[in-house]
């Protein structure tokens, strides 16, 4: 099973200069429960919601928001309507938050293109996420990593050789870009929560078993968001529209009610049971 | 627990206005919507408007736009519904919602009369 | 905005019996995007709020008993009692979750016979 990738696409409309549409999508095999569009930077870390969408329960939004709507069963799109005549938007970050069972919460961010030309836009660029649970194994063997590196450059100072300068084998810049902090932002996720994994997330205690939408617990300590460089409206280097964040651990706030998550099984907040906070969730 | 409890009944002049609360818990109030929807005696439901308390961005029933004020305050988890320019066919309850109608309030009879 | 409304305005069943309420809405409730129906049907209780007891036209939200399903698909839609209890005497409400502003039908009121 593939490592669940987000994409986000900008674009402006060709006939009309003063409305754009926000794609966001998500690559993975999990089923999706709910997605939050924001803008101004990710949702719960100083971004304003535009929208938000359950795939059974509907959709809300709110201006500049214009219509919000589910593409296929795994992307939305968000048309916007720019009033000012100054086109804000294109300066603007949007971010798109999946929510997904069992992977947890994804987000990532784009921007229009700072000369792309009016309707016209890159394709979306999916850049590997690291996934919460490999995020312990990352930290341990990045401390090792950097160990070895570290006497591997005393050792070439001696020899008075410069030091190798490693690269990622993408050649795109965005890959270059977000897979380069992707590691590290996940590693720091690992040694500041070595629990906030998918697998010990869980209160298996509190499972419902009794009905078909039934919920189980999510304890707080699960509900760390790192954010870095791509939750910036200011990385250059990302030119063309689109570019992915690592996984931003389960869901964003431990106070707040997550998702329903999809047959028998739904996250909360504590530990307190399946019957804590009844019934599903939804933002229409 | 997610609840919603809103205030009390109340009784009310005709053109004079009204403001019904709605306080929230048991979940983080400022990242979801709260709904009010309205149903006079006998009658279905309405819709008249919504807002996220985060930012508070709302959304209004063009039916009562202009007339209706809806506000959050976030340091108490409280929403309010405003209708003003009252008129005897606003006697109604009026409830407060969130989670795509999963959550009510009580509700709460406001009686317009002379 | 659209339009649901409800067929019949009220209905009543004997006890153990099937009660199937009808609702028609004026526009296509279903998003081609993600073949996904987006109507709810609420249950109201005298002096109560209304209950959630189906949404994306055919999902049972949480407690609600298996007796009660949706089905339908664009603007015909259907709420089924498989068999009739005492408590489930109400009045049933179908709801446009698809676009602004929400709305919902007139109303079904069901009774024992």
């Known amino acids: 099973a593939g490592t669940p990738e987000v994409w986000v696409q900008v674009q402006m409309e060709a006939t009309e200069l003063s409305s754009f549409t926000v794609h966001c999508g998500f690559l993975g095999p999990g089923s999706i429960s709910l997605v939050t569009v924001s803008w101004g930077g990710p949702d719960g870390a100083g971004g304003t919601k535009l929208a938000v969408l359950h795939p059974e329960l509907g959709t809300r939004q709110w201006a500049p928001a214009r219509q919000a709507r589910w593409e296929t069963q795994s992307s939305i799109s968000l048309a916007l309507e720019d009033s000012g005549a100054s086109s804000p938007f294109a300066n603007t970050t949007f971010c798109c938050k999946f929510a997904s069972f069992p992977e947890g919460s994804w987000e990532s961010c784009g921007s229009l293109p700072p000369s792309s030309d009016p309707g016209l836009s890159a394709p979306p660029t999916p850049v590997p996420i690291l996934r919460a649970d490999l995020a312990g194994i990352l930290g341990l063997s990045g401390v090792l990593l950097f160990g070895c590196g570290y006497l591997l450059h005393l050792l070439r100072r001696q020899k008075h050789r410069p030091t190798p300068r490693l690269q990622p084998s993408h050649t795109n810049s965005q890959a270059l870009t977000a897979q380069a902090w992707a590691p590290s932002q996940a590693s720091q996720a690992a040694l500041h929560d070595p629990y906030a994994t998918i697998n010990t997330s869980f209160c298996p205690a509190t499972l419902d078993t009794a009905h078909p939408n039934g919920w189980a617990s999510l304890p707080t300590h699960a509900a760390h968001q790192p954010q870095g460089p791509a939750a910036s409206a200011s990385t250059p280097i990302l030119a063309r529209g689109s570019f992915v964040s690592v996984e931003n651990g389960l869901y964003t706030q431990a106070g707040e009610r997550p998702p329903h998550t999809g047959p028998g099984l739904t996250l909360f907040p504590d530990c307190r049971g399946p019957r804590a906070l009844e019934g599903r969730f939804g933002v229409r | 627990e997610v609840q919603l409890v809103q205030s009390g009944a109340e009784v009310k002049k005709p053109g004079s206005s009204v403001k019904v609360s709605c306080k929230a818990s048991?979940?983080?109030?400022?990242?979801?919507?709260i709904e009010w929807v309205r149903q006079a005696p006998g009658q279905g439901l309405e819709w008249m408007g919504e807002?996220?308390?985060?930012?508070?961005?709302?959304n209004y029933n063009e039916k009562f736009k202009g007339r209706v004020t809806i506000t959050a305050d976030e340091s108490t988890s409280t929403a309010y519904m405003e209708l003003s320019s009252l008129r005897s066919e606003d006697t109604a309850v009026y409830y407060c919602?969130?989670?795509?109608?999963?959550?009510w309030g009580q509700g709460t009879l406001v009686t317009v009369s002379s | 905005d659209i339009v649901m409304t409800q067929s019949p305005d009220s209905l009543a069943v004997s006890l153990g019996e099937r009660a199937t309420i009808n609702c028609k809405s004026s526009q296509s409730l279903l998003n081609s995007g993600n073949q996904k129906n987006y109507l709810a049907w609420y249950q109201q209780k005298p002096g109560q709020p209304p209950k959630l007891l189906i949404y994306?036209?055919?999902t049972r939200e949480s407690g609600v008993p298996d007796r009660f399903s949706g089905s339908g698909s664009g603007t015909d839609f259907t709420l089924t009692i498989s068999s009739l209890q005492a408590e489930d005497v109400a009045v049933y409400y179908c709801q446009n979750a698809h676009s602004y502003p929400p709305t919902f039908g007139q109303g079904t009121k069901l009774e024992i016979k």
């Open positions: 048991g979940y983080t109030f400022s990242s979801f919507s």
């Open positions: 807002i996220l308390p985060g930012s508070n961005s709302t």
């Open positions: 919602s969130s989670y795509w109608f999963a959550y």
């Open positions: 994306g036209a055919s």
